[in-house]
C-alpha cells in the first residue's frame, strides 16, 4: 500500500466525513511537526510529543466514527512512522533508550 | 448531560487558584476533549486549554498559558485548572467544555474568577 | 496553533435582510470550524460544525460555508433574535480544539 501522502482531505468544503481521511489529515499534522526536527528523530524527549499527539489524533477519530482503537488502519500509520522516522533509531542510543513499548514494535495501546 | 465549574473566587494577584470542572451524564473517553475557555467581562472567548479525554492524559495549551496554567484530569468524570501568578488581566468568566473535531457541544455556565487587591 | 481573524464589529442588518461575517485562520484547518452564537449572560451556543452542517436546532437561515482557510458564515430572514455576538473557533487543528475569532456583533435594526 502506498505511503501516506499530504494531500487536502476534505476539499470540497466542510470537514472530512469518514476515518480514511481524517486520518490523512492526523498524519498531515504529524508531518508538520516531524519535519523540522529531523536531526532528532531518535531522541525521544523531542518527538514523544508529536508521536503521542498523532495516536490521539488517530484514537480520537476512531471514537467519531464509532470505531476501536487500535485499529488497521491506525495500526499502518503507526507501523509506516517507524518506518520512515525511526527505522534507523538505535535502541542503544541513551537519548532513545527508554523508547514507549509500541516504538520497540508491539503497537497496543498505550499510557504516556 | 452536562457540565458545571466550582471554585471561582476573589483573589489577590500573585494568588493561586483552581478551578473544577463535574461532568454528569458522560464520563470521559477519547470521543471527548475537555477544555477550559475563559471571557473576560465584555470581551471575546479565549480557549486556554484541553486535555484528551483518552487514556494518555495529553494536554494542549494557549502559547500564552503554558506555564501558568495546568489542566488535570483527576477521574473519569472531573478535571481541574489550576492557575499560579495570577493578575488583574486573569479575571474572568472561566467555562469548561466539553470539545469533538466538530466543535464544542457543551458548555457549563461559567465560574467567575476575580483578581483585584 | 491556528490563529483566527474575525469581520470587525459590528456588522449591521435589517430585519428580514441578509449578513455576512467572514473568518480566516492562519493556517489550513481544512474543515475543521465551528461557529457559535453568544448572547449577553449566556455560554455560547453551538450554531455551524464541521464548517458547513447546522447544528441541532439552528434554524436553516443560519449558513456556514468555507475550507482551508477562509469561512463565512451567513444570515438569511434576520430577525431581531439574532442580534448576538458570533465567533469563529478552529474546532481541531490536528492537536486539540483551540483559538477562537475576535468576535463579531450583529446589529439588527
Known amino acids: 500500500q502506498p505511503l501516506p501522502t499530504t494531500g487536502t482531505p476534505g476539499s470540497e468544503g466542510g470537514t472530512v466525513k469518514n476515518y480514511e481521511t481524517a486520518v490523512q489529515f492526523c498524519w498531515n499534522h504529524y508531518k508538520d511537526q516531524m519535519d523540522p526536527i529531523e536531526k532528532d528523530w531518535c531522541d525521544w524527549a523531542m518527538i514523544s510529543r508529536p508521536y503521542s499527539t498523532l495516536r490521539d489524533c488517530l484514537e480520537h477519530f476512531a471514537e467519531l466514527f464509532d470505531l476501536g482503537f487500535p485499529n488497521p488502519l491506525a495500526e499502518r500509520i503507526i507501523f509506516e512512522t517507524h518506518q520512515i522516522h525511526f527505522a534507523n533509531c538505535s535502541l542503544v542510543q541513551p537519548t532513545f533508550s527508554d523508547p514507549p513499548e509500541d516504538v520497540r514494535g508491539s503497537h497496543h495501546h498505550h499510557h504516556h | 448531560q452536562s457540565v458545571e465549574e466550582s471554585g471561582g473566587d476573589l483573589v489577590k494577584p500573585g494568588a493561586s487558584l483552581t478551578l473544577t470542572c463535574t461532568a454528569s451524564?458522560?464520563?470521559?473517553?477519547?470521543?471527548?476533549?475537555m477544555c477550559w475557555v475563559r471571557q473576560a467581562p465584555g470581551k471575546g472567548l479565549e480557549w486556554i486549554a484541553c486535555?484528551?479525554?483518552?487514556?494518555?492524559?495529553?494536554s494542549y495549551y494557549a502559547r500564552w498559558a503554558k506555564g501558568r496554567f495546568t489542566i488535570s484530569k483527576t477521574s473519569s468524570t472531573t478535571v481541574t485548572l489550576r492557575m499560579t501568578s495570577l493578575t488583574a488581566a486573569d479575571t474572568a468568566t472561566y467555562f469548561c467544555?466539553?470539545?469533538?473535531?466538530?466543535?464544542?457541544?457543551?458548555w457549563g455556565p461559567g465560574t467567575l474568577v476575580t483578581v483585584s487587591s | 496553533a491556528a490563529v483566527m481573524t474575525q469581520t470587525p464589529s459590528p456588522v449591521s442588518g435589517v430585519v428580514g435582510g441578509t449578513v455576512t461575517i467572514k473568518c480566516q485562520a492562519s493556517?489550513?484547518?481544512?474543515?475543521?470550524f465551528s461557529w457559535y452564537q453568544q448572547k449577553p449572560g449566556q455560554p455560547p451556543k453551538l450554531l455551524i460544525y464541521s464548517a458547513s452542517d447546522l447544528a441541532s436546532g439552528v434554524p436553516s437561515r443560519f449558513k456556514g460555508s468555507g475550507s482551508g482557510t477562509q469561512f463565512t458564515l451567513t444570515i438569511s430572514d434576520l430577525e431581531c433574535a439574532d442580534a448576538a455576538t458570533y465567533y469563529c473557533?478552529?474546532?481541531?487543528?490536528?492537536?486539540?480544539?483551540?483559538?477562537f475569532g475576535g468576535g463579531t456583533e450583529v446589529v439588527v435594526k
Open positions: 473557533q478552529c474546532s481541531y487543528d490536528g492537536s486539540s480544539p483551540n483559538a
Open positions: 451524564g458522560f464520563s470521559f473517553s477519547s470521543r471527548y476533549y
Open positions: 467544555v466539553r470539545s469533538d473535531a466538530w466543535g464544542v457541544n457543551l
Open positions: 493556517q489550513s484547518i481544512y474543515g475543521y
Open positions: 486535555i484528551f479525554g483518552g487514556s494518555s492524559d495529553n
